[in-house]
Amino acid sequence: MKSGLWYFFLFCLRIKVLTGEINGSANYEMFIFHNGGVQILCKYPDIVQQFKMQLLKGGQILCDLTKTKGSGNTVSIKSLKFCHSQLSNNSVSFFLYNLDHSHANYYFCNLSIFDPPPFKVTLTGGYLHIYESQLCCQLKFWLPIGCAAFVVVCILGCILICWLTKKKYSSSVHDPNGEYMFMRAVNTAKKSRLTDVTL
């Protein structure tokens, strides 16, 4: 049941990326939709060895990843604002899940290059537009109605079954032989109770 709802959610959410609308827009596919979420790809040049990459939603820092090296060429990778992220030799991918309308916004990759010098900051970004398809909206509208109708049908079915059972039962009570048998059962029960009391 859970997986069914999840697939429905995936079906409903579709992502459209509008790049080139902002200054320093990414000249690559920045948003990759998969597994019920979005992978936001932040690229950096191959020569960059030490850096801080921040994912900004509007002006707010959502995630960050810092890669530095110590004096013995030992690598340190830190996150102050942790998100599920993936580091490669020329990109950092940040993953956002459980998408809804609130995720629609401008997203920026804010890259601070420490090494090689000089220190440099670059900003690239794009707009992540999340909308629901017409079919989704129709399904969203009809699904509760369908569920309600199903429940009503179930209840009516139960009532009908109960009514039919009662009808069948009452017809058997009106049968003369049936009535005689019923009376006998009651009398026997009464006798046994009296016997119990006497003892």
Epitope: T66, G70, S71, N73, S76, K78, F114, D115, P116
Partner: antibody, heavy 117, light 111 residues
Framework: EVQLVESGGGLVKPGGSLTLSCAAS????????MDWVRQGPGKGLEWVGN????????YYAPFVKGRFTISRDNAKKTLYLQMNSVKSEDTATYYC??????????WGQGTLVTVSS | DIVMTQSPSSLAVSPGDKVTINCKSS??????????LAWYQQKTGQAPKLLIF???TRHTGVPDRFMGSGSGTDFSLTINSFQTEDLGDYYC?????????FGPGTKLEIK
């Protein structure tokens, strides 16, 4: 302006302990790896060890062999070097240094540690 | 551990001289496009100061008479026109691996 000021040096007996401190100012201390480098009297420079930005990882020179511990308090912007089981060959001026991504770009004035009975 | 050697161990110079200090590593310090080697100057009674990093890049505020060169295992520091304030000890240092090690130093003295 970046400033590193060491303190805590002095005379200590062999086998004894000493803690050196390094107060940092003029930069975001929690953004940098920090190192200790020492220099014996009339000798060259020798790397002691380092610590990463949040203090979770440390590396030491082979001669340390578990005797020294580097730690940091980012809230106090202070670097520490805890020296245990000191030997006469640990006599040196100890420098606190900032690893500026690709070299030791800032050094303290140094603090002298003398190990003698 | 990578062993760093320097030559000469000391050198007597006069103001205006071109001075060259050599540094050799026991293995290549080249990684990608970068040589993981730095040069430091230490004046008497003072802490060392960074001059050159990545074998040839001058640190901020370092006079342009100081030049670093070399690649792989052989490096040199050149002072194009030696001045009296350049007196002191010069150390090369690698940061290719742990532990980072320093050369034994070269002492520059007045002739």
């Amino acid at each position: 302006e970046v400033q590193l000021v060491e303190s805590g040096g002095g005379l200590v007996k062999p086998g004894g302990s000493l803690t050196l401190s390094c107060a940092a100012s003029g930069f975001t201390f929690s953004d940098y790896w920090m190192d200790w480098v020492r220099q014996g009297p009339g000798k060259g420079l020798e790397w002691v060890g380092n610590i990463d930005e949040d203090g979770s990882t440390t590396y030491y020179a082979p001669f340390v062999k578990g005797r020294f511990t580097i730690s940091r308090d980012n809230a106090k912007k202070t670097l520490y070097l805890q020296m245990n089981s000191v030997k006469s060959e640990d006599t040196a001026t100890y420098y606190c240094t900032r690893w500026g991504r690709y070299a030791f770009d800032s050094w303290g004035q140094g603090t002298l540690v003398t190990v003698s009975s | 551990d990578i062993v760093m050697t320097q030559s000469p161990s000391s050198l007597a110079v006069s103001p205006g001289d071109k001075v060259t200090i050599n540094c050799k590593s026991s293995q290549s310090l080249l990684s990608g496009n970068y040589n993981y080697l730095a040069w430091y100057q230490q004046k008497t009674g003072q802490a060392p100061k960074l001059l050159i990093f990545y074998a040839s890049t001058r640190h901020t505020g370092v006079p342009d008479r100081f030049m670093g060169s070399g690649s792989g295992t052989d490096f040199s520091l050149t002072i194009n026109s030696f001045q009296t304030e350049d007196l002191g000890d010069y150390y090369c240092q690698h940061h290719y691996s742990t532990p980072p090690t320093f050369g034994p130093g070269t002492k520059l003295e007045i002739k």
